[in-house]
Interface confidence: medium
C-alpha cells in the first residue's frame, strides 16, 4: 500500500518569496509522484518544480499559485494511486499604483470652492492601511479643512481652494510590507487674480510675402496685461515696432498680425500675460517659412502584363509636409480602380500593355510644387523575326547563326551550345541583334545550338544543328625533320582528314621511286631496315575528289643513336682531393657532352679554375669541398637523339688511421686517391 509520511498543508506565503509544499511517500514498488493544481497536473518550471516528492516554489506568484494543490502517488506497475490532503496558500502581497482624480471627472472641471476627491491605487492582501501626503508632508484627519480617513484609499477636499494646491502622494502598508504611489497627482487651484490662458498662440507656417496671425488671450480679475516679444526679447507694440517687424500689428483682443512675411521674421514669438498677482504666464509659438525641396529621380520601370506593381513616390522634404498625388496623361489618378493611388504609391493592378507611358508624381505645399516623371514600360514576350537555321559551316572560317527577335523592352539573347551557356570569348561573339558569330570554326563546333530571347514578360527559344565542313588537313601535320636509327626498322606516319576520307601516298622529293625495302602502307612510310641512302627529302600527299590535294615535306636523317662507352660511377673523394667523373659517348652525328651538377648545367666557359671538362667528355674537379657533393649528370646529344646518365659524388673528411688498422687495410669506401 502507498502511505504518505508527510502531507502538504495550507500555509501563509509571501509574494515572490520561496515556499515548499511537503510530500513524502512510502511504498513497496516503483512509485511515481506528481502534483495537481485544481485537478490539472503541475508541469515543472524554473519557478515551480518537484524536489524529490515535494513541490518547491522559487518565487510564489499570487496569480499562478492560487488554487488547491494535491500530491498524487501512483504505482507504475499496479496502477494503485493515493492522493494527499488538499493544500493552498494564503498569499500576502502589496502592489503600488498611481494617485488618480476620482471627482470631478477631469482636471479641467476643478474650480475653486468645488469638492475634490483623490484615490490611492495601492492594492494588497491583507487589506492595506493608507497614509496621504501633500508636497511630502503627511496629512491627518480634519487638517486644514479636508476630510481624510487614514484607513481608506480616498482623500476628499471640501471645498478645495488655492491653498490646497500641491503634489499629492500616498503610501500603504500591510503584513507583506509597504508601497508608495507609483505616480503622484498635482492639484492646481488657481487664484482669480492670476493670469489664466484662454487662447494660446499656435505655430504657423506661411509662404514668403504672405501674412501670419497669432491669437493670444488671458483672463483674470482684474483683467491682466498682455505683451508680445520676438526672439531677441524686443517688445512688439503698435507704437514701437522693431526694424525687422515694421509690418506687425497688435489688436485689442491680443492677436498679432504679420504682413508680407520675410525669412528674417521667422522665429519664436512670446505672448506674456501678467495678472495682479502670481507669476507671468509665457506662451510661445513659432513662425516657420514654408519650403519645399527637389524630388529624387525615378529609375525607368519595366513591368509585365497581368502582374500587380507599385511605384513609391518619396515626397520631398518640406514645411509643411507636402501633399503627394499621381497623374497620368495630365489626369490625376483616382484612389481606387485598376490603376490608382494608395498613399504615396502608384498601384497598377493587372497591368495591360496600354498602361505603358509616363506617370508623374506631384508634391505641393505652401512653398510651391515639385514633380518627377517615371517612365513605365510594359514588357511583351519576344516574337521571331528570324530563327536560327540548321547550317553547314566551313572549318577555319567564321560562321554565323541568326536569332532575330523583337519585343518591348529590347530582348536579351543568350546562346547555348550542347546545353551549356556560351560565354563570349575569343571564338564566340554575340551581336546586339542576337546573331552568334563563331570565329575560326572547328570540327567539334558541329553540334546543337539553342538561342533564348527574353524580356521580363517571358522568353522564346529555338535550336539549330551545325554541321562543320572539314577542310582537307593533316592530322597531325608530320614533323618536318625526323631521325631514323641506322640499321633498324623505322616508320614515318602521315594521316589526314577532309569532307571525304582522303587518299594518302608518299613520294621522294626528287621524284625517284621508293626502294623495295620501303613500303607505303595507308599513309605510313615503313623502312624494314634503314640504310644511309634512305636519308633525304620525302613528301606526303593527301587528296580527295572535292578538295584536291595537300602536301607535307619531311626531311629524314639517318643516324646512329647515342650509346655510352664510359659512364660515370658512384664516387667518393676526400675533401681537398681531385674527383674524376668519366663519361664517353658514341653515335652519328658525333654526340656532344654536357654536364649537369646539382640541377644546373655546367657551362664550360664559366667553370672557374677548379673544374674542367675534357675533350673526351670526362669532368674533373680539383680541391673538392663538401658543397661539391651531389648528383652529376652526363648528357650526350646530337641532332637526332639525347641520352643521359648520372652518378653521385660524395666528399668526405679523410679518416685518422686507428692502431688496429694495419697498413694494408682498405679504406671503408671506393676512393679516388691522387
Amino acid at each position: 500500500a502507498i502511505v504518505f509520511i508527510k502531507q502538504p498543508s495550507s500555509q501563509d506565503a509571501l509574494q515572490g518569496r520561496r515556499a515548499l509544499l511537503r510530500c513524502e511517500v512510502e511504498a513497496p514498488g516503483l512509485v511515481h509522484v506528481y502534483w495537481l493544481l485544481d485537478g490539472a497536473p503541475v508541469q515543472d518550471t524554473e519557478r515551480r518544480f518537484t524536489q524529490g516528492s515535494s513541490l518547491s516554489f522559487a518565487a510564489v506568484d499570487r496569480l499562478q499559485d492560487s488554487g488547491t494543490f494535491q500530491c498524487v502517488a501512483r504505482d507504475d506497475v499496479t496502477g494503485e494511486e493515493a492522493r494527499s490532503a488538499n493544500a493552498s496558500f494564503n498569499i500576502k502581497w502589496i502592489e503600488a499604483g498611481p494617485v488618480v482624480l476620482k471627482h470631478p471627472a477631469s482636471e479641467a472641471e476643478i474650480q475653486p470652492q468645488t469638492q475634490v476627491t483623490l484615490r490611492c491605487h495601492i492594492d494588497g492582501h491583507p487589506r492595506p492601511t493608507y497614509q496621504w501626503f501633500r508636497d511630502g508632508t503627511p496629512l491627518s484627519d480634519g487638517q486644514s479643512n479636508n476630510t481624510v480617513s487614514s484607513k481608506e484609499r480616498n482623500l476628499t477636499l471640501r471645498p478645495a481652494g488655492p491653498e490646497h494646491s500641491g503634489l499629492y502622494s500616498c503610501c500603504a502598508h500591510n503584513a507583506f510590507g509597504q508601497a508608495c504611489s507609483s505616480q503622484n497627482f498635482t492639484l492646481s487651484i488657481a487664484d482669480e487674480s492670476f493670469a489664466r490662458v484662454v487662447l494660446a498662440p499656435q505655430d504657423v507656417i506661411v509662404a514668403r510675402n504672405e501674412e501670419a496671425m497669432f491669437h493670444c488671450q488671458f483672463s483674470a480679475q482684474p483683467p491682466p496685461n498682455l505683451q508680445w516679444l520676438f526672439e531677441d526679447e524686443t517688445p512688439i507694440t503698435n507704437r514701437s515696432r522693431p526694424p525687422h517687424l515694421r509690418r506687425a500689428t497688435v489688436f485689442a483682443n491680443g492677436s498679432l498680425l504679420l504682413t508680407q512675411v520675410r525669412p528674417r521674421n521667422a522665429g519664436v514669438y512670446r505672448c506674456i500675460g501678467q495678472g495682479q498677482r502670481g507669476p507671468p504666464v509665457i506662451l510661445e509659438a513659432t513662425l516657420h517659412l514654408a519650403e519645399i525641396e527637389d524630388m529624387p529621380l525615378f529609375e525607368p520601370r519595366v513591368f509585365t502584363a497581368g502582374s500587380e506593381e507599385r511605384v513609391t513616390c518619396l515626397p520631398p522634404k518640406g514645411l509643411p509636409e507636402p501633399s503627394v498625388w499621381w497623374e497620368h496623361a495630365g489626369v490625376r489618378l483616382p484612389t481606387h480602380g485598376r490603376v490608382y493611388q494608395k498613399g504615396h504609391e502608384l498601384v497598377l493592378a493587372s497591368i495591360a500593355e496600354s498602361d505603358a507611358g509616363v506617370y508623374t508624381c506631384h508634391a505641393a505645399n505652401l512653398a510651391g510644387q515639385r514633380r518627377q516623371d517615371v517612365n513605365i514600360t510594359v514588357a511583351t514576350v519576344p516574337t521571331w523575326l528570324k530563327k536560327p537555321q540548321d547550317s553547314q559551316l566551313e572549318e577555319g572560317k567564321p560562321g554565323y547563326l541568326h536569332c532575330l527577335t523583337q519585343a518591348t523592352p529590347k530582348p536579351t539573347v543568350v546562346w547555348y551550345r550542347n546545353q551549356m551557356l556560351i560565354s563570349e570569348d575569343s571564338r564566340f561573339e554575340v551581336f546586339k541583334n542576337g546573331t552568334l558569330r563563331i570565329n575560326n570554326v572547328e570540327v567539334y563546333d558541329g553540334t546543337w545550338y539553342r538561342c533564348v530571347s527574353s524580356t521580363p514578360a517571358g522568353s522564346i527559344e529555338a535550336q539549330a544543328r551545325v554541321q562543320v565542313l572539314e577542310k582537307l588537313k593533316f592530322t597531325p601535320p608530320p614533323q618536318p625533320q625526323q631521325c631514323m636509327e641506322f640499321d633498324k626498322e623505322a616508320t614515318v606516319p602521315c594521316s589526314a582528314t577532309g569532307r571525304e576520307k582522303p587518299t594518302i601516298k608518299w613520294e621522294r622529293a626528287d621524284g625517284s621511286s621508293l626502294p623495295e625495302w620501303v613500303t607505303d602502307n595507308a599513309g605510313t612510310l615503313h623502312f624494314a631496315r634503314v640504310t644511309r641512302d634512305d636519308a633525304g627529302n620525302y613528301t606526303c600527299i593527301a587528296s580527295n575528289g572535292p578538295q584536291g590535294q595537300i602536301r607535307a615535306h619531311v626531311q629524314l636523317t639517318v643516324a646512329v643513336f647515342i650509346t655510352f662507352k664510359v659512364e660515370p660511377e658512384r664516387t667518393t673523394v676526400y675533401q681537398g682531393h681531385t674527383a674524376l667523373l668519366q663519361c664517353e659517348a658514341q653515335g652519328d652525328p658525333k654526340p656532344l657532352i654536357q654536364w649537369k651538377g646539382k640541377d644546373r648545367i655546367l657551362d664550360p666557359t664559366k667553370l672557374g679554375p677548379r673544374m674542367h671538362i675534357f675533350q673526351n667528355g670526362s669532368l674533373v674537379i680539383h680541391d673538392v669541398a663538401p658543397e661539391d657533393s651531389g648528383r652529376y649528370t652526363c648528357i650526350a646529344g646530337n641532332s637526332c637523339n639525347i641520352k643521359h646518365t648520372e652518378a653521385p659524388l660524395y666528399v668526405v673528411d679523410k679518416p685518422v688511421p686507428e692502431e688496429s688498422e694495419g697498413p694494408g687495410s682498405p679504406p671503408p669506401y671506393k676512393m679516388i686517391q691522387t
Epitope: H32, V33, P41, D44, T50, Q51, S53, E81
Partner: antibody, heavy 123, light 112 residues
C-alpha cells in the same frame, strides 16, 4: 493488467501519409503521457516526443517537427502518430511508451511499451 | 541536445562471465530537482525494450539482482555479475533529465 496495443504493419509509397494507433488499457488514460520512439532497421532508439493526455499538448523533438503529428482520442484511450509526405528514411518500427507527466520522486520514464508498428516506405 | 555514448558497441561474453557496459553523457544529467534520470533498457530481437534500471541504480521490480547500475554526473555503468542466456540482446542507456530525452547508441551482448 496494463497494456499498450499498436496497429499493424504498414507498406507505403513515398509522399503518402501513415497514421499509427496505440490503444491503452488497465489504467486511467489521462493520468499518464504517451511518448513515441523510432527505431530504424538495425539502428538504435530515438525519442520523437510526447503528448500530454490531460491537456492534449504535444512536444516534438526538432528532428521530427514538421511532418510528424501526435493526437488523441481520449474517449477511446488511444494515442495516434501521423507522418505526412513519407520518405524512404521513415522506414522504421515505431513504439508508443507510457510516460509520467512530470519528474517524480521514484519514477521511471518508459515502464510500459507497445509491441511496435513497422512502417515500410518503398516505391 | 545531450549526446549519450555507449561502449563497447559489441560485447562477446561466455555464460557465467561478468559483463560491464559504459555510458557517457556529453553534459551533466543531474536534473534541477537533484535527481539523475539515467535508465537502462534491454531489447531482445523482435521485442519492445524492457526497463531494467531507473535513476542510475534502482532495479525495476522483477529484474534479477545480478543487474546493477552505478555512476554519477556524466559517467555511468551497467554490470551483469553472471551472464545468463536470457540476458543476451541490445542494451540501451537513456537520459530523461533534459529535453529532448536521448538514448545511447546501444551495446550488443552476445556469446563468444
Amino acid at each position: 493488467q496494463i497494456q499498450l496495443v499498436q496497429s499493424g504493419p504498414e507498406l507505403k509509397k513515398p509522399g503518402e501519409t501513415v497514421k499509427i494507433s496505440c490503444k491503452a488499457s488497465g489504467y486511467t488514460f489521462t493520468t499518464y503521457g504517451m511518448s513515441w520512439v523510432k527505431q530504424a532497421p538495425g539502428k538504435g532508439l530515438k525519442w520523437m516526443g510526447w503528448i500530454n493526455t490531460h491537456s492534449g499538448v504535444p512536444t516534438y523533438v526538432d528532428e521530427f517537427k514538421g511532418r510528424s503529428a501526435f493526437s488523441l482520442e481520449t474517449s477511446a484511450s488511444t494515442a495516434y502518430l501521423q507522418i505526412n509526405n513519407l520518405k524512404n528514411e521513415d522506414t522504421a518500427t515505431y513504439f508508443c511508451a507510457r510516460s509520467p507527466f512530470d519528474y517524480g520522486s521514484r519514477g521511471a520514464w518508459f515502464v510500459y511499451w507497445g509491441q511496435g508498428t513497422l512502417v515500410t516506405v518503398s516505391s | 541536445d545531450v549526446l549519450m555514448t555507449q561502449t563497447p558497441l559489441s560485447l562477446p561474453v561466455s555464460l557465467g562471465d561478468q559483463a560491464s557496459i559504459s555510458c557517457r553523457s556529453s553534459q551533466s544529467i543531474v536534473h534541477n530537482n537533484g535527481d539523475t534520470y539515467l535508465e537502462w533498457y534491454l531489447q531482445k530481437p523482435g521485442q519492445s525494450p524492457k526497463l531494467l534500471i531507473y535513476k542510475v541504480s534502482n532495479r525495476f521490480p522483477g529484474v534479477p539482482d545480478r543487474f546493477s547500475g552505478s555512476g554519477s554526473g556524466t559517467d555511468f555503468t551497467l554490470k551483469i555479475s553472471r551472464v545468463e542466456a536470457e540476458d543476451l540482446g541490445l542494451y540501451y542507456c537513456f537520459q530523461g533529465s533534459h529535453v529532448p530525452w536521448t538514448f545511447g547508441g546501444g551495446t550488443k551482448l552476445e556469446i563468444k
